[in-house]
Interface confidence: low
């Protein structure tokens, strides 16, 4: 049905925009309101995405691109071409199955988006924590204990025994 | 994931009325035109009728004018086509689909389809 492009093919005239219309003798017939064709020589216009709901506009469809959706305030895209929509948590938070908890102790996430991760464990490096972490924010390792002056102290937390992705429920 | 299912068919008498229902889920059903078609035993898939996403504008068979009307409600994701004085050649199976595009095959062809249902016999 569909017949090959060639030097010859009509088809292969029609630019972005346009689709060749087999109905009317393989004339270039501009792609309908919200449809669009990205390439010449098509014999379709595909119809835009709409962004609807979660989603809003972020890039109109033209008649040679589709829409672009991203995600209203609340939410974060996932997915190609922001496919999907996904609920924002606060800082110190993970999204799970029961909705956003808060990250375990030992674990932080800085973003609105993502899982809590653990601490640095800031004596694989041979450093010492120079500010404790918080479920907002990593610790911040200092200096080696070797270096510190005499009389000055570091505590360094045992690193979380936990698998990323799971928190208390 | 995208389904359509069709319903409302039966025997009638020539003369009679008919309402078939196609109830649509997993997309947004607003976004694309459909079509109802038919087939009747040995035959080709025939193209009954077309409306547009939104209900602007629609396309009907020669020998359904005046006689079928194709409607539909966006809210709760249905296709209808009133079928009035039915005459035996509408005896067939018919399917409701979906419009994947604007077609240079023409939208009379089920090549710009890309999601039927299953059927509905009326006889």
């Known amino acids: 049905f569909e017949r090959t492009r060639s030097l010859q093919d009509p088809c292969s005239n029609c630019p972005a925009g346009t689709f060749c219309d087999n109905n009317r003798n393989q004339i270039c017939s501009p792609c309908p309101p919200n449809s669009f064709s990205s390439a010449g020589g098509q014999r379709t216009c595909d119809i835009c995405r709409q962004c609807k709901g979660v989603f809003r506009t972020r890039k109109e469809c033209s008649s040679t691109s589709n829409a672009e959706c991203d995600c209203t305030p609340g939410f974060h895209c996932l997915g190609a071409g922001c496919s999907m929509c996904e609920q924002d948590c606060k800082q110190g938070q993970e999204l799970t199955k029961k909705g956003c908890k808060d990250c375990c102790f030992g674990t932080f996430n800085d973003q609105k988006r993502g899982i809590c991760r653990p601490w640095t464990n800031c004596s694989l490096d041979g450093k010492s924590v120079l500010v404790n972490g918080t479920k907002e924010r990593d610790v911040v390792c200092g200096p080696s204990p070797a270096d510190l002056s005499p009389g000055a102290s570091s505590v360094t937390p045992p690193a979380p025994a936990r698998e990323p992705g799971h928190s208390p429920q | 994931q995208v389904q359509l299912q069709e319903s409302g068919g039966g025997l009638v008498q020539a003369g009679d009325s008919l309402r078939l229902s196609c109830a649509a889920s997993?997309?947004?059903?607003?976004?694309?035109?459909m079509a109802w078609f038919r087939q009747a035993p040995g035959k080709e898939r025939e193209f009954i009728g077309r409306?547009?996403?939104?209900?602007?504008?629609?396309d009907y068979a020669d020998s359904v004018k005046g006689r079928f009307t194709i409607s539909r409600d966006n809210p709760k994701n249905t296709l209808y086509l009133q079928m009035n004085n039915l005459k035996p050649e509408d005896t067939a199976v018919y399917y409701c689909?979906?419009?994947?595009?604007?077609?240079?095959?023409?939208?009379?062809?089920?090549?710009?389809?890309?999601?039927w249902g299953q059927g509905t016999q009326v006889t």
């Open positions: 689909a979906r419009q994947r595009s604007y077609s240079g095959y023409g939208i009379r062809t089920p090549q710009t389809y890309d999601y």
């Open positions: 997993g997309w947004a059903f607003d976004n694309y035109g």
């Open positions: 409306l547009a996403w939104n209900g602007g504008s629609t």
